[in-house]
C-alpha cells in the first residue's frame, strides 16, 4: 500500500505540530494514538509521532490510555488487515480477525469489552485480501480508568498512521 | 432499497430545516457533506442539499473542506460500494476499493493520509456485492488546512445522502 | 439508488434557519444504547443496563431516541452479524445485511435514512461468517425528533454490549 503513511522526513517534522485549542477556557482531554509501524508482530500505541497526540491530561501507560478525569468520552479505534493468497501447497485455514477496545477499571477485576468488531477471512489461491474495521461510541468513564485494545490477527495488520489508530475525547 | 429517498411533498417541507446551534457562546465549527448523486463517475461533495451543512466557518473549496480555526477536530467519512456479478464471458478481475481522507497543509508539500480504509473484492458469477467503509478520528488541524478525500472504485459508489458522506466538527 | 435526495428546489432553501440555544450551557445531552441480548429475533434498544446510558434529556420512545433539544448531534450505530455454514442439503442463498439509522419527524410521512451500511453475504459450505458494520455522522436535529434504526438480518445479530449499539451526543 504505497504512500499511506508519512515519509520519514515529514514524520520528523510532524512531531512539532502545535498543541492547539479552540477558544474555550475549559480543558478538553483528547488523544489519538497510532500503531507503531516498526513493531510488526505486536500492536504498540504511540503518541509522539506523525499526527498522534495526547492533550489535557491523557497519558499512555502499559499500552493503555489513562482517563484523565471522570466524564463521558467518545472512544474509537480502527485496524486494517491484509494478507496474501495461500500457497497451493499449504492448507487454507480460515482466519479469525477481531479488534476490541477494552476498559480496565478499579470497579471490575477484569477487562470489559467496550467496542468489538470481528471478521472471518477465507484466503484463496492467488487472492490477496484486505479488510478494515472501525468502531467508536460514547462511554461514561472514571478518572484513572484504562482503555486498551486487543487484536486477533496482529501479524496481518497494515501498520500506518492512517490505517491503525486508537483515540478518545471528552464530550 | 425501498424508501431511502424523500417524496416530492416531503422534499417541499424539508426546505425549512433549521440551521441550529447548541448553547455555547463560542462557535462550534461543524460540517457534513454528501456525495452528489447526479455525478456518477466522480465524487463531488455538496453541502447545500438534504441534511448536509456547513456551520461556523467551515467552507468548501475545490472539493475540500477548509478548516476555519486551529484546534482539534473529529473528521469522518463513509462510502458504500456495490457491483454486479461479472459476465460468464468476461474475466473476473479483483477490484481494489479504497477510501481515504487526506490533509493538505502548508506544512507539507503533499497530501497526508489521515484516514484510510481498503478492501479487495472478487466478483463472482451471479453474485452482486455490496461493501461499506467508515472511518473517523481526532486530529490537530490548523486554520486553512484542506481536508479532501481520495477514492478507488468511484464507479461503484452507491451515491445517496445516507451512504456516502464526509464531515468534521471541532472538539 | 435514484431519487434518494431532495429536489433541487428543496435543496436551495434547505440552507436557512433560526439559531437555537440550550437553556443551560453546562448540559451535554448524550445517549448510548445497547441491543437487548434477551430478545433474539428483534433489536430492542436498552439504556438501563451495562454501559448504556441516557444523559441530560435524552429519552426513549417506541424503540427510538428522542432528541432533547435542537442542535447538531453526532449520531452513530454498530451491528455485528454472524452465521454458520449452510447445510450441504440446503440451497445457499445470498444474505442481504443492512443497518440504517433513520429520522422520523412529522414533517415527513416516512422515516428518512441518515446513515446506511449494507453487505451481501454468500454463506459457503463449512464456512461460518462474521461481519461488522459501523457508521456515524453529524446532523442538525430538532427537539422531539425521533432517531430509530432498521436492520435487515436481525436473526444474525451478535447481541452483546460491545457489538450492537446506537448512540448520539450533542456537539
Amino acid at each position: 500500500l504505497p504512500g499511506v503513511g508519512l515519509t520519514p522526513s515529514a514524520a520528523q517534522t510532524a512531531r512539532q505540530h502545535p498543541k492547539m485549542h479552540l477558544a474555550h477556557s475549559t480543558l478538553k482531554p483528547a488523544a489519538h494514538l497510532i500503531g507503531d509501524p516498526s513493531k510488526q508482530n505486536s500492536l504498540l500505541w504511540r503518541a509522539n509521532t506523525d499526527r498522534a497526540f495526547l492533550q489535557d491530561g491523557f497519558s499512555l501507560s502499559n499500552n493503555s490510555l489513562l482517563v484523565p478525569t471522570s466524564g463521558i468520552y467518545f472512544v474509537y479505534s480502527q485496524v486494517v488487515f491484509s494478507g496474501k493468497a495461500y500457497s497451493p501447497k499449504a492448507t487454507s485455514s480460515p482466519l479469525y480477525l477481531a479488534h476490541e477496545v477494552q476498559l480496565f477499571s478499579s470497579q471490575y477485576p477484569f477487562h470489559v469489552p467496550l467496542l468489538s468488531s470481528q471478521k472471518m477471512v477465507y484466503p484463496g489461491l492467488q487472492e490477496p485480501w484486505l479488510h478494515s474495521m472501525y468502531h467508536g461510541a460514547a462511554f461514561q468513564l472514571t478518572q484513572g480508568d484504562q482503555l486498551s485494545t486487543h487484536t486477533d490477527g496482529i501479524p496481518h495488520l497494515v501498520l500506518s498512521p492512517s490505517t491503525v489508530f486508537f483515540g478518545a475525547f471528552a464530550l | 432499497l425501498p424508501g431511502v429517498g424523500l417524496t416530492p411533498s416531503a422534499a417541499q417541507t424539508a426546505r425549512q430545516h433549521p440551521k441550529m446551534h447548541l448553547a455555547h457562546s463560542t462557535l462550534k465549527p461543524a460540517a457534513h457533506l454528501i456525495g452528489d448523486p447526479s455525478k456518477q463517475n466522480s465524487l463531488l461533495w455538496r453541502a447545500n442539499t438534504d441534511r448536509a451543512f456547513l456551520q461556523d466557518g467551515f467552507s468548501l473549496s475545490n472539493n475540500s473542506l477548509l478548516v476555519p480555526t486551529s484546534g482539534i477536530y473529529f473528521v469522518y467519512s463513509q462510502v458504500v460500494f456495490s457491483g454486479k456479478a461479472y459476465s460468464p464471458k468476461a474475466t473476473s478481475s479483483p477490484l481494489y476499493l479504497a477510501h481515504e481522507v487526506q490533509l493538505f497543509s502548508s506544512q507539507y508539500p503533499f497530501h497526508v493520509p489521515l484516514l484510510s480504509s481498503q478492501k479487495m473484492v472478487y466478483p463472482g458469477l451471479q453474485e452482486p456485492w455490496l461493501h461499506s467503509m467508515y472511518h473517523g478520528a481526532a486530529f490537530q488541524l490548523t486554520q486553512g488546512d484542506q481536508l479532501s478525500t481520495h477514492t478507488d472504485g468511484i464507479p461503484h459508489l452507491v451515491l445517496s445522502p445516507s451512504t456516502v458522506f464526509f464531515g468534521a466538527f471541532a472538539l | 439508488l435514484p431519487g434518494v435526495g431532495l429536489t433541487p428546489s428543496a435543496a436551495q432553501t434547505a440552507r436557512q434557519h433560526p439559531k437555537m440555544h440550550l437553556a443551560h450551557s453546562t448540559l451535554k445531552p448524550a445517549a448510548h444504547l445497547i441491543g437487548d441480548p434477551s430478545k433474539q429475533n428483534s433489536l430492542l434498544w436498552r439504556a438501563n443496563t451495562d454501559r448504556a446510558f441516557l444523559q441530560d434529556g435524552f429519552s426513549l420512545s417506541n424503540n427510538s431516541l428522542l432528541v432533547p433539544t435542537s442542535g447538531i448531534y453526532f449520531v452513530y450505530s454498530q451491528v455485528v452479524f454472524s452465521g454458520k455454514a449452510y447445510s450441504p442439503k440446503a440451497t445457499s442463498s445470498p444474505l442481504y445485511l443492512a443497518h440504517e439509522v433513520q429520522l422520523f419527524s412529522s414533517q415527513y410521512p416516512f422515516h428518512v435514512p441518515l446513515l446506511s451500511s449494507q453487505k451481501m453475504v454468500y454463506p459457503g459450505l463449512q464456512e461460518p461468517w462474521l461481519h461488522s458494520m459501523y457508521h456515524g455522522a453529524a446532523f442538525q436535529l430538532t427537539q422531539g425528533d425521533q432517531l430509530s434504526t432498521h436492520t435487515d438480518g436481525i436473526p444474525h445479530l451478535v447481541l452483546s454490549p460491545s457489538t450492537v449499539f446506537f448512540g448520539a451526543f450533542a456537539l
Partner: antibody
C-alpha cells in the same frame, strides 16, 4: 420571561369535544415543543403528548392516541389540544408546558379546567 | 408503561426538619427521574432533573439521589414555603409517567 396562557376550558357534554389553546410568549416559539399535561381533581399528573411548532412533529401517550390531536400555529405563537369523545374521567385541569430539555417540564401555564358532565 | 410509586403518600413535619420522599420505578430507568413541587391551585414547578441535578433557581436544601429503580428527594431543612405536594417523574421512556404524589403537611 417565558409565559404560557391556556384557554378554552369549561363544561363539556360526554361524547363531546374540546379545543384548548396555549398562547406562548417570551421566547422563540419554534425552538421548543409544547407539552400538554393533565391533572384530574385530587389526582396526579398525566402526560398527554407534545407538538413541535417548528416542524409539526408530535408524540402522544398511547392512552390518548386517536382521541387527542396536538397542533400549533406559528403565526399566532399558539399551541392547541383537541380532544374528542370526552367522558367523565377526562375531567381535569389541562396544562401546557414548555421544556428546557425535551422531557423536563420547566415552564407551565396556569391550567384550564375542563369538566365533562351532563 | 413504567409505574412510579411514591412513599409516603403524605407526611407531617415541622420547619427545620429533614424530609425524605422516595420513589420506586417499576423497571430500571437509569438516572432519568425528575421531581416537581406543586402548591394548591398552582402549576407544578421543576426542582430536580436527571435524579440529582437541581434546576435553575432551586434552593440548595433540595437534593435528589438514586439510580435504577429507587430514588429519593431530600429537603435538608424544611422551610414554611416547602409545604406542598411533591411528584416524581420518570423521563427514561414515553409515556413519561408521574408518581401519585407525596403531600408534605405542617405538623
Amino acid at each position: 420571561e417565558v409565559q404560557l396562557v391556556e384557554s378554552g376550558g369549561g363544561l363539556v357534554q360526554p361524547g363531546g369535544s374540546l379545543r384548548l389553546s396555549c398562547a406562548a410568549s417570551g421566547y422563540t416559539f419554534t425552538s421548543y415543543v409544547i407539552h400538554w399535561v393533565r391533572q384530574a381533581p385530587g389526582k396526579g399528573l398525566e402526560w398527554v403528548g407534545y407538538n413541535n411548532p417548528y416542524n409539526d412533529g408530535t408524540n402522544y401517550n398511547e392512552k390518548f392516541k386517536g382521541r387527542a390531536t396536538i397542533s400549533s400555529d406559528k403565526s399566532k405563537n399558539t399551541a392547541y389540544l383537541q380532544m374528542n369523545s370526552l367522558r367523565a374521567e377526562d375531567t381535569a385541569v389541562y396544562y401546557c408546558s414548555r421544556p428546557t430539555m425535551l422531557p423536563w417540564f420547566a415552564y407551565w401555564g396556569q391550567g384550564t379546567l375542563v369538566t365533562v358532565s351532563s | 408503561d413504567i409505574q412510579m410509586t411514591q412513599s409516603p403518600s403524605s407526611l407531617s413535619a415541622s420547619v427545620g426538619d429533614r424530609v425524605t420522599i422516595t420513589c420506586r420505578a417499576s423497571q430500571a430507568v437509569s438516572s432519568a427521574v425528575a421531581w416537581y413541587q406543586q402548591k394548591p391551585g398552582k402549576a407544578p414547578k421543576l426542582l430536580i432533573y436527571s435524579a440529582s441535578h437541581r434546576y435553575t433557581g432551586v434552593p440548595s436544601r433540595f437534593s435528589g439521589s438514586g439510580s435504577g429503580t429507587d430514588f429519593t428527594l431530600t429537603i435538608s431543612s424544611l422551610q414554611p414555603e416547602d409545604f406542598a405536594t411533591y411528584y416524581c417523574q420518570q423521563h427514561y421512556s414515553t409515556p413519561w409517567t408521574f408518581g401519585q404524589g407525596t403531600k408534605v403537611e405542617i405538623k
